[in-house]
């Protein structure tokens, strides 16, 4: 789910189980041999699998947790072949005779096996035959295998948690992208769809779950009645990456929807007993109904299980009919969870349930089109969640959460287009690189733009047609454009300037986005590829010369204007954008277009004037847009930085969340660049002045912080008020944090701090405090029952101002008994976000890179987030040299999924150095003048 889907599958140490036959010599592999190529040949297609798995949840004599498996795959031969190539990773087969048995189905004659081998580099099991398999014939290949049930969060893996003082062990799966092959031999590509009959053999006191319901009840294993056999119904035709099976002692809360679909939320027995699954249960039914309606297709399976796992690397995973989640993405405790925890639960559920149709029923043929799968779900998650929580205005949150967040990356010269040619995506590492913010958030942004200019009704019509046409099949993004085009062609009210494909090609095949510049004196409008660093060199060519076909909406003096299309030309003119001297015009209403806007200086001044006199005339999203765009434009030298800062002056009269959030996230860059310099004092003073009215507003509204505002956006605004007031030294706020935390320390059983305010109060109290406060919070983390509470404490512990405490804390991240592997990156990043912790975290990452890479390489460590996190403040020549040295020093180890992030960090550091040189003086003077 979203940027948290860190599914990196490369660089996993070989499991220490019995040796297998492998071919190594990666460099000299003969590419003409199909087993040395990463893509499967299409000579054989899987029809069905029968897979039996038996996980052992106690260690064997060697201290290893293992699983044993048996698979029978039925193959249809398409072309004559004397070799069977099937994925297999870290699985051990018998060393006696051949690794597999081959049989003909019906009258198919089967050639003898010559030899079998494992090719480690391409992750294949290869069966060489003495004769050829024949087209049109079916064959069955049987294999038995053994693998390690490791705690590596990939394939069939082990998760551990404590119940009281008892360690509990469960077995679960994470197949996406390329780890189904780590659980059983399979044709592990998304277009190789087949049906699956899964059987789990498990201890009889545990529950077995899979994609489908069980066939009847579990039966005792004849040879050992302490074990049960659970056989599941046959799945529909599906991709391997969506398989899931889990053996645990989890419990569930259930309901049956009107359409007969069984909905269950599974979690640790304690969590279920305390009602932490109820919110998820309450929203799942409505969200499933919403999507069935949105897609005009009923839910394709008989049941919908969702399970919260203690060790889980992604945010969540959309396995068909058995969705897996991090605990904090599914469980909600009204007593200790904040409104943002609740928002996360409903949006992540909506994201994963959106995939049950888009992605699961209809699947992209190859990982190069991942952006459509994830971008689509990242857009419609807001629609599904909005249906479940209609009073929250959730749809607005895509603007800060996805649109502007990804624009910061997409405005770099090192960005890349949404669409990558299939032939450039082959290895597990290359597939892993597809899971980035461009795929998720830019994907979401351009699909939202498309839905907006088509209108939602027309979009839904084309979408339903696409889903009906390709159910149980595979597609490319062009298939969706084609079905949307059919919907456009069948009506007359929506007129497009070109085909859906032609318009969308501009947004998917070239990186970046345009800045639209308006001259309101003449009505001239122009477009240009927007780069945060105006001098950076774009080496990637574009077939469209970095011009887009841009849908433009606008408001003039508060009145909505006609829709306008800027064709893929650099300049045009229209009177829609021409104003009289006292008027103003504002483009990109509600930021439905994926672009930024610049105006002539007079129009900027008129907008500022409007905001300072009567801000309600401008829609709330556009009040945020004015701030976001102007700060970005200032970074790119397209407007003076003082103009952007002037656009924050109206905030002392602003109560809404989004404009404040825009300012805080824009100014967070200023903090990163200046919180080690003399600019920071006047900057804090200015922010104190601006936030004080907001702080006082909420102090009154909440009766001195004893109640909460009613709606979500106001609750978020209250959190911002306290967070900004405290971090900028407003004395009333610092006293509030200290008082509340002291109160809690004196009575640990009764936490007086409302869940919404905990993150910010904890952080500020720990920052003001010393070892006592830190150790108290660490103690609370150790006994935290709910992961949401643990997350808040873990993050707050990084707020300390004591170097030795922060260094000790960094050490804890390498001990999985103290900090779970899944939380290690975010903990190091939290420490790095603290100005005092930043150099410590950077030193730590440099010193421990090899260890981090080797111990955490199997998908449990988001290296791109880590590199980004520890280098965010870099803005000096010395830091640039350090970064270049770090790159040199670790070329042998590599950077895995962080390879691209390292290049971006180098580029960003150079840009930061330049920006500080240019802006320090003028920013210092502006803050002095306005504070």
């Amino acid at each position: 789910y979203a940027q948290e889907k860190n599914k990196n599958a490369e660089h996993v140490p070989q499991a220490p189980t019995s040796p297998t036959i492998t071919t190594t010599a990666a460099i000299t592999l003969d590419q003409s041999k199909p087993w040395n190529r990463y893509r499967l040949p299409t000579t054989l297609l899987p029809d069905s699998y029968n897979v039996t798995l038996r996980p052992y949840l106690t260690p064997n004599a060697d201290g290893l947790y293992i699983f044993k498996g048996k698979s029978i795959v039925r193959l249809l031969c398409q072309e004559p072949t004397d070799v069977i190539i099937i994925h297999s990773k870290k699985l051990n087969y018998t060393t006696q005779g051949h690794m597999v048995v081959l049989r003909g189905v019906g009258d198919s004659q089967v050639p003898e096996i010559d030899r079998t081998e494992l090719v480690e580099l391409t992750e294949y099991l290869v069966v060489h035959l003495k004769g050829s398999l024949q087209p049109g014939h079916m064959y069955e290949m049987e294999s038995e295998f053994q693998g390690e049930l490791a705690d590596d969060l990939a394939g069939f893996y082990r998760s551990e948690y404590m119940e009281g003082n008892v360690k509990k062990v469960l077995a679960t799966t994470q197949m996406q992208s390329t780890d189904a092959r780590k659980s059983f031999p399979c044709f592990d590509e998304p277009a190789m769809k087949a049906t699956f009959n899964i059987t789990l053999i498990h201890p009889n006191n545990l529950t077995a779950l899979s994609n489908m319901p069980p066939k009847g009840s579990s039966t005792p294993l004849a040879e050992d009645p302490n074990w049960s056999v659970t056989e599941f119904e046959t799945t529909p035709v599906m991709s391997t990456y969506l398989l899931a099976y889990i053996v645990s002692e989890f419990q569930s809360v259930n309901e049956t929807a009107q359409n007969g679909v069984l909905i269950r939320i599974w979690a640790r027995p304690n969590a279920i007993a305390e009602g932490h699954g109820m919110y998820a249960l309450n929203v799942t039914g409505p969200i499933l109904n919403f999507f069935a309606n949105h897609y005009n297709t009923s839910y394709p399976l008989p049941k919908s299980d969702q399970i919260a796992l203690p060790d889980f690397n992604a945010g969540a995973m959309e396995n068909w009919g058995l969705v897996t989640y991090r605990e904090n993405a599914l469980l909600f405790d009204p007593q200790s969870s904040s409104i943002s925890n609740k928002e996360r639960v409903v949006t992540v559920i909506a994201h994963e349930l959106a995939h049950q149709w888009f992605g699961n029923l209809v699947t992209l043929a190859w990982w190069n089109d991942l952006w459509l799968n994830e971008g689509f779900a990242s857009y419609v998650e807001y629609l599904g969640a909005d249906h479940a929580e209609p009073t929250w205005n959730l749809k607005d949150l895509i603007v800060p959460g996805d649109v502007y967040r990804v624009m910061a990356v997409d405005a770099l010269a090192s960005s890349h287009p949404l669409t990558t040619p299939a032939e450039e995506v082959n290895t597990p590492a290359q597939i892993s690189e597809m899971f980035d913010s461009i795929s998720y958030s830019k994907g979401a942004s351009v699909i939202r733009m498309l839905s907006n200019f088509l209108t939602e009704d027309l979009f839904k019509e084309g979408l339903a047609s696409y889903l009906h046409a390709f159910a149980y099949q595979n597609t490319t993004y062009l298939d969706l454009w084609e079905h949307l085009q059919k919907a456009v062609d069948a009506q007359t009210s929506i007129r497009l300037p070109d085909t859906v494909r032609a318009i969308m090609d501009r947004w998917t095949l070239q990186m970046g986005f345009p800045v639209i510049t308006v001259d309101t004196k003449t009505g001239n409008i122009s477009q240009k590829h927007f780069l945060l660093d105006s001098e950076s060199n774009v080496t990637r060519s574009s077939a469209f010369d970095y011009l887009w076909i841009v849908p433009i909406s606008s408001i003039k003096n508060g009145v909505m204007q006609d829709h306008y299309w800027l064709r893929d030309v650099s300049q045009a003119q229209n009177d829609l954008f021409k104003t009289a001297s006292d008027d103003w015009v504002l483009l990109n209403v509600n930021v439905t277009g994926y672009f930024q806007v610049n105006y002539d200086e007079d129009n900027w001044r008129m907008i500022q004037h409007q905001l300072q006199t009567n801000l309600s005339v401008i829609p709330v999203i556009n009040r945020a847009q004015v701030i976001y765009d102007s700060f970005n434009l200032a970074t790119a030298h397209m407007v003076p930085v003082t103009l952007a800062l002037d656009n924050t002056l109206f905030l002392n009269g602003e109560k809404e969340y989004m404009p404040w959030q825009a300012a805080l996230s824009s100014l967070s860059y200023f903090s990163l660049m200046f919180d080690r310099s003399e600019v920071y004092g006047p900057m804090k003073k200015y922010l104190r002045k601006q936030v004080e009215p907001l702080f006082q507003h909420f102090e009154t509204l909440t009766k001195n912080w004893t109640e909460r505002p009613e709606n979500l956006m106001d609750q978020y605004s209250e959190i911002n008020a306290i967070s900004t007031a405290c971090s900028n030294g407003l004395p009333q706020c610092e006293n509030l944090a200290k008082t509340l935390f002291d109160q809690w320390m004196s009575d640990p059983e009764n936490n007086p701090i409302h869940p919404n305010l905990r993150s910010t109060i904890y952080c500020n109290a720990i920052a003001q405090g010393g070892q006592d406060q830190w150790d108290f919070a660490w103690g609370q983390l150790q006994q935290a029952q709910l992961v949401n509470e643990a997350d808040k404490l873990r993050s707050a512990l990084a707020c300390s101002n004591e170097v030795w405490l922060l260094n000790r804390y960094l050490g804890y991240t390498l001990n999985p008994d103290l900090i779970r592997k899944q939380d290690a990156t975010s903990t190091i990043n939290s420490i790095a976000s603290n100005v005092i912790g930043q150099p410590l975290a950077w030193d730590f990452v440099q010193s421990n890179w090899k260890k981090l890479f080797q111990d955490y390489g199997g998908g449990s460590f988001s290296f791109s987030n880590l590199i980004q996190g520890v280098t965010r403040r870099f803005s000096s020549e010395f830091e640039l040299q350090q970064l270049e040295q770090f790159k040199k020093n670790n070329m042998d180890v590599g950077f895995g999924s962080g390879t691209r992030a390292l290049e971006q960090a180098l580029e960003k550091t150079k840009a930061n150095i330049k920006w500080v040189k240019e802006n320090k003086e003028v920013v210092l003077n502006w803050f002095i003048e306005h504070s």
Epitope: K68, T95, E144
Partner: nanobody
């Protein structure tokens, strides 16, 4: 080279139970499919039960299905045959065998390593 040694045979009354063990030595049997065969006086050696190298596949002769259960313990390098509801016609010398493959077979010729056998007599 794998050496196999059966034990656990003996005299038992009809309806009784016995558990035969087959201990491997010389080399681990963990990668081999293992089988039990029997030979009554004057008859050919016949298949009784087999188990694959992982233990996930078991095969039984129709005459013993539901009464006999084969299992393996790779840590102990041992294969077992639990025999319940024994009948006089189960009387025979029982042989343990290892296959040079991980996959089960019912055919005597597919097994390359054999034990010496253990006598099972079912009589009142």
């Amino acid at each position: 080279q794998v050496q196999l040694q059966e034990s656990g045979g003996g005299l038992v009354q009809p309806g009784g139970s016995l558990r035969l063990s087959c201990a491997g030595s010389g080399r681990t049997i963990s990668n081999h499919a293992m089988g039990w065969f029997r030979q009554a006086p004057g008859k050919e050696r016949e298949f009784v039960a087999a188990i694959s190298w992982t233990g996930l596949t078991t095969n039984y002769a129709d005459s013993v299905k539901g009464r006999f259960f084969i299992s393996r313990d790779d840590a102990e390098n041992t294969v077992y045959l639990q025999m319940n509801s024994l009948k006089p016609e189960d009387t025979a010398v029982y042989y343990c065998a290892a296959r040079q493959s991980g996959y089960v077979s019912k055919f005597v010729d597919d097994y390359g390593y054999w034990g010496q056998g253990t006598q099972v007599t079912v009589s009142s």
